[in-house]
Structure formats: C-alpha cells, structure tokens
C-alpha cells in the first residue's frame, strides 16, 4: 500500500503517457487521477511500466470501483490483466466475446492461469451456455480447453458448437467426457453422408456405444487403429470378428501389434479362437473350440 | 527464446561514459516502446529513459537529462543508452522493458546490467 502524500507542484499528470515511468510509486499514487486512467487504460500497454507501478496503477483502479470495474476498462486492461486476482475477476461481468479476445491475448502461449479459468467461468455463465463462437474462441487459445469441463459443464454446450471443435481440442478428454460429447456430435453430423460424416465423429468415438460401432462396420469407414484403441472396451467387446474388420477395413492388420493391449486384448478374450483365425493374423487367446460361452451378464438381468 | 539482454555495464571513474546494449532476441523490438530503469541497492527501481516504437519520441528523468540518450538500431534489434558525465549516484543495476502498446499485450524485462561509478 503506498502511503497518501500531496502530489507534487506541477506533477499532476495532465494524461497518461511515457513521463508516468519516472514518477515513483508515491508520486503515481498522488498524481494520477484515478478517473483519468480509467478513461485512457489503452495506454497502459504501450508504455514500459515497472510491474510495482503496475501495482499502484491497479490500487487506483480498484478504488475507483470497489465493485468490480466496469468492462470498458476490462477491454482495455492489457497486461494489467495479469496483475488480476480470481477474486477481483469475480467481480466482474463480461459480456462481450472482444473483451474476452483482448484478455486471452494477454496470457497467450501460458498455461491457463486461474485468472483466466475464472475468467471464462464468468464469461460462459453470463452467456448461460458454451455457444459455438466462443468455443471457437476458447479452443483457438487453448486446445485443451474443452477436456478441462467437467461432464456436467459439457452437457452445456449445444451441439451446434460442436462444430467449431478440432481433432486436437480432443486429445485430454477422457472416456466420461467423451460419452457426453459423442451424442451432441451425432445430432450436430447427421445430415452428412457416410464418408464425411465419418471423418467428423471419428474424434468422438471414444464415446459411442456398440450399436453405433455395428451401424459403422457396414459403411466401409477403414477406421484406423489409433480410433480403434480409444474407444470403450465395453462398446467393443460385443463386436463379433466380422464386423471389426469391415469396421478397420486394411487397418485390421494392426490388431496384432496391439494384442496386448485394451480394447484389443479384453475383445480377443471373448471371440472363438475359430473366428480369430479367419483373421489369418496370428491372434492368440480366443475361446478354444467346443467351449460354452455363457453370458452371465444376461443370466442376471433374467433373474 | 524470447528474451531480451543487457550488456555493457562495468565498473567507471566519475566523469566517464559507458554505452549499455538492449537487445531483443525471438522477437521484433520495431514494433516495442522501450524503457531503461535502474535499481540501487536497497532503492525503489526507477525510470531513467524512454524511447517510441518509431524512434520519434524520447524521453529522461530529470536526473539524467543532459547527459544520458537513448537511441536504436532496429536492423540489429537494438536498443542503446550513451551514458556520459557519469556520477556516483548513476550506481545500480540497469534493465531494459519493452511494451507492445495496444493490440499487443506482449511486454518483456532483461535481468540487468551493473554499473558502478565509483574513483
């Protein structure tokens, strides 16, 4: 805190320019007119202040808006932004998706700080859901954003945004989040024909269930062993031989590089040796011939 | 990496000169206004001088002014401040900051240069 002193003779700071780096924290205190500053803040980032004059710059500000600052001044922040705690976000409301731009570019090529995750908590719960524009926005500062939702906040995003997300925003979600995203991708592509509609679902195939995997086995898709391995074991493992090698087309060969690993090994335990064979690729490990396969999922559900 | 370094810095008699580099690397220092501060031992850091993005505008605090200036180079991503009639109280650590005005919310330190004027 810097202490109340007058401002000196002729050092009232007429507006905010480059002379403001000479003043020292006591003088910046006393001379600025907090007023003023607010209305000029798209200075502030053209000059060079010390990060301690920043300080003093925010103390002003925060004075002048004990509740939260207005989002003219928010826009204009720059990288006072940085400066920010998640509890004076918190008393802001942002509205515009340009404030949200200017803010992002701010922190651009760091982790996502709190500042920012608080900041788009504010922002998405002022809009009421994750509309497709600011998705875009979001994922394009930061792929992993839409994988750092909670399922909850997912079952949020109409399936119209869906759209707007890439291969990569996916690569951090995991199956739970997945099976929230995979239903509104279906809904967002099913106007699409058989080819370019699979090349849409195929990042969100970790959660689609079996009857899906079954109705894709039929329309010659050649899924690639990298999808195949991150789909649930338990969607998979009803899939008879047949229909995954019309599901991975040429790429069935991959199989046995992967043997070892889920879904494929879990999926190799419940076919019939016999059927695996058919493959001609060596796989070991289905039900030796002759063997009963009993179904004790089904028998429970019966009793 | 984007950084930006000072160099030039040593030890000076009072009276003698010394010419400090700023010099940006990973990034343009074109489009960066450009300040130099110092720091004694036990002091608050201050501003000593300032330079537009162009070239265009500069700028000195008082205790400076007459004796210090500060230029660049921008086809050697350079910036320099010629410090001549040096005193004992020119004493400190000297970095370079540069802003990126509006737009560009890019804003980088150096870690600092030592001077010290001392018979």
């Known amino acids: 805190e810097v202490e109340k002193t007058a401002c000196p003779s002729g050092k009232k700071a007429r507006e905010i320019d480059e002379s403001l780096i000479f003043y020292k924290k006591w003088e910046l205190e006393a001379c600025v007119d907090a007023a003023l500053l607010a209305t000029q803040m798209d200075r502030v980032n053209a000059i060079p202040f010390t990060y301690e004059q920043l300080d003093v710059l925010k103390h002003k500000l925060d004075e002048l808006y004990p509740q939260g600052y207005p989002e003219s001044v928010i826009q204009h922040l720059g990288y006072l932004f940085l400066k920010m705690s998640p509890e004076d976000i918190r008393k802001w409301n942002v509205t515009s998706l340009e404030t949200l731009k200017a803010l992002l570019e701010v922190n651009k090529g760091h982790e996502m700080s709190p500042q920012v995750a608080t900041l788009i908590d504010r922002f998405v719960k002022g809009r009421g859901q994750l509309d497709k524009d600011t998705l875009d926005t979001l994922t394009a500062f930061y792929p992993g954003y839409l994988c750092s939702l909670s399922p909850e906040e997912l079952s949020s995003v109409p399936p119209s945004s869906i759209w707007a997300v890439r291969p990569q925003d996916l690569d951090t979600c995991d199956p739970r989040q997945l099976d929230v995203l995979y239903p509104k991708a279906r809904l967002a592509f099913q106007n699409m024909n058989g080819s370019e509609y699979f090349v849409k679902i195929q990042s969100f195939l970790g959660g689609a269930p079996t009857e899906d995997l079954k109705a894709l086995s039929q329309q010659n898709v050649s899924m690639d062993l990298a999808t195949f391995m991150k789909l649930r074991t338990d969607a998979v493992l009803p899939l008879t031989v047949a229909e995954v090698q019309k599901l991975l087309g040429p790429h069935v060969e991959g199989l046995k590089a992967e043997e070892r690993h889920r879904p494929v090994r879990d999926w190799i335990l419940r076919q019939r040796q016999d059927d695996l064979d058919t493959l001609g690729l060596g796989l070991q490990g289905g039900i030796p011939n002759g063997y009963l396969v009993l179904d004790l999922s089904m028998q429970e559900a019966l009793s | 990496e984007v950084q930006l370094v000072e160099s030039g810095g040593g030890l000076v008699q009072p009276g003698g000169s010394l010419r400090l580099s700023c010099a940006a690397s990973?990034?343009?220092?074109?489009?960066?206004?450009i300040g130099w501060f110092r720091q004694a031992p036990g002091k608050e850091r201050e501003g000593v001088s300032y330079?537009?993005?162009?070239?265009?505008?500069?700028n000195y605090a008082d205790s400076v002014k007459g004796r210090f200036t500060i230029s660049r180079d921008n086809a050697k991503n350079t910036v320099y401040l010629q410090m001549n009639s040096l005193k004992p109280e020119d004493t400190g650590v000297y970095s370079c900051?540069?802003?990126?005005?509006?737009?560009?919310?890019?804003?980088?330190w150096g870690q600092g240069t030592s001077v010290t004027v001392s018979s």
């Open positions: 330079i537009s993005s162009s070239g265009g505008s500069t």
């Open positions: 990973g990034f343009t220092l074109d489009y960066y206004a």
């Open positions: 900051a540069a802003a990126g005005g509006y737009g560009n919310s890019s804003r980088y």
